[in-house]
């Protein structure tokens, strides 16, 4: 039995499609293709003759349409006009002419979408973000993507206004990336050029750890005092020390060379943060032994958490 | 007190290159980054990169990648800045400078400058 | 890059003026914003970083403000030593950049 095969089925706009006749009967001398469901003279696209391989234009002809001598027609550079049915009439030998339709779907093109953001810096725990993809599509599927995987399922994440909005409630650090937004229809997609979502974040509660000399944290008079201080922030913090109260360096590591009982105290590390307008900071005491005795670092630290 | 003391003016003629040289003293040399500005004649300020002392980790402003190295030796806090291919318009006074603190700071103390001059 | 741009570029007061200076940035700068005074053949000399933070010995007749892109160096009452170019300059992460300058003088 005679059929036509469009390939492809969905066609975007711009693009070709191909008409393929499938079971052609052995005494067939001609074709003709219609646009439509059924043989009308107005609706006549082109006419062959297989003996000339001759081919002639009819009143539906628009100039895209190329026939081939195995009955297939090629239309090329589709508007969104060109969608519906196709009747391949191939005319016998015998004179008992046989038909088949076909059909397509034109889709238009998409354009390559864009993302807006209502905030690129977002602070964490406190601001949620809105990415908006553009432009609006009817009969379009929209889709997100995060850091090139497809979007997390997490209730802070929601999507709204048929997926062309994505909110991200009380952004998390984690959040943090590359957004892209797709759109797709039957015969196309297209994905925007990613986004990089910055949250800004912390500073968190710092830590203090000793460093080389001594390990085991034991400070025995005459001994290095080599403190650092680390706390996890974007961007990095700004860090402060002050020994008993009195302002020190702005470093992150805290040296003091040969270290006697005056030593004895409160060491405390500020970092702030002036992104997120947030600071911490942690206190430790500090005990010298003059003797062989080594009370080191006090084990209860204490920190301070500022907003 | 802290003391940022730079080598002597330097003539260098076009396709050369120069090396100058930053001693600290008077802080512990491998707490604060080092940075590198320069000033042309009349001209403002320019941020040229920076050495981190304590790693040697290196960031170079874009217009300088490829012609400048910055280096330090740890044993005498010298820092060094080699800048390559020079052409007319590298002729200006270079300042290194110490990071007010780490991370986000700006610079609080200046070398004295050291004018190079390139000139055929 | 970020872009410091700072107006105005010269300026000409006289003693006891009040002086305004202004600094934009090309981004969000989150107050990391440094202000330098440059005398004629002399280093620059750091005198107000986090925006507003004074350095310690600078006169207290300067003061910083501003904030997200905008910044103002505000000289309350001039003085004939104050006479020099000021530069702002963003402090957050690298590459720095610093405004073109402005070169204040006494009428």
């Known amino acids: 039995k005679l059929t036509i095969e469009s390939t492809p089925f969905n066609v975007a706009e711009g693009k070709e499609v191909l008409l393929l006749a499938h079971n052609l009967p052995q005494n067939r001398i001609g074709y003709s293709w219609y646009k439509g469901e059924r043989v009308d003279g107005n609706s006549l696209i082109v006419g062959y003759v297989i003996g000339t391989q001759q081919a002639t234009p009819g009143p539906a002809y628009s100039g895209r349409e190329t026939i081939y001598p195995n009955a297939s027609l090629l239309i090329q550079n589709v508007t969104q006009n060109d969608t519906g049915f196709y009747t391949l009439q191939v005319i016998k030998s015998d004179l008992v002419n046989e038909e088949a339709t076909g059909q397509f779907h034109v889709y238009p093109e998409l354009p390559k979408p864009s993302i807006s953001s209502n905030n690129s810096n977002p602070v964490e725990d406190k601001d949620a973000v809105a990415f908006t993809c553009e432009p609006e599509v009817q009969n379009t599927t929209y889709l997100w993507w995060v850091n090139g995987q497809s979007l997390p399922v997490s209730p802070r994440l929601q999507l709204s206004n048929g997926n062309m909005t994505l909110t991200l409630l009380s952004v998390k650090r984690n959040d943090a990336g590359s957004y892209e937004c797709e759109i797709q229809n039957p015969a196309s997609a297209n994905r925007s050029d990613p986004v990089t979502l910055n949250v800004l974040y912390g500073p968190d509660v710092p830590t203090i750890s000793p460093i080389i000399s001594p390990p085991d944290s034991s400070y025995l008079s005459g001994a290095n005092l080599n403190l650092s201080c680390h706390s996890a922030s974007n961007p990095s913090p700004q860090y402060s020390w002050r020994i008993n109260g009195i302002p020190q360096q702005h470093t992150q590591v805290l040296f003091i060379a040969k270290i006697t009982p005056n030593n004895n105290g409160t060491y405390a590390c500020f970092v702030s943060n002036l992104a997120t307008g947030r600071n911490n900071s942690i206190v430790k005491s500090i005990t010298v032994s003059a003797s062989g005795t080594s009370p080191g670092l006090s084990a209860g630290a204490h920190h301070h958490h500022h907003h | 007190q802290v003391q940022l003391v730079q080598s002597g003016a330097e003539v260098k003629k076009p396709g050369a290159s120069v090396k100058v040289s930053c001693k600290a003293s008077g802080y512990i040399f491998t707490s604060y980054w080092l940075h590198w500005v320069r000033q042309a004649p009349g001209q403002g300020l320019e941020w040229i990169g920076y050495i981190n002392p304590q790693t040697g980790y290196t960031s170079y402003a874009q217009k300088f990648q490829g012609r400048v190295t910055m280096t330090r030796d740890t044993s005498t806090s010298t820092v060094y800045m080699e800048l390559s291919s020079l052409r007319s318009e590298d002729t200006a006074v270079y300042y290194c400078?110490?990071?007010?603190?780490?991370?986000?700071?700006?610079?609080?103390?200046w070398g004295q400058g050291t004018l190079v001059t390139v000139s055929s | 890059d970020i872009q410091m741009t700072q107006s105005p570029s010269s300026l000409s007061a006289s003693v006891g003026d009040r002086v305004t200076i202004t600094c934009r940035a090309s981004?969000?700068?989150?107050?990391?914003l440094a202000w330098y005074q440059q005398k004629p053949g002399k280093v620059p000399k750091l005198l107000i970083y986090?925006?507003?933070n004074l350095v310690e010995g600078v006169p207290s007749r300067f003061s910083g403000s501003g904030s997200g892109t905008d910044f103002t160096l505000t000289i309350s009452s001039l003085q004939p030593e104050d006479v020099a170019t000021y530069y702002c300059?963003?402090?957050?992460?690298?590459?720095?950049?610093f405004g073109q300058g402005t070169k204040v003088e006494i009428k």
């Open positions: 400078a110490r990071e007010y603190g780490n991370y986000n700071y700006p610079l609080d103390y």
């Open positions: 986090n925006y507003k």
């Open positions: 981004e969000n700068q989150y107050g990391y």
């Open positions: 300059q963003h402090h957050l992460g690298t590459p720095y950049t």
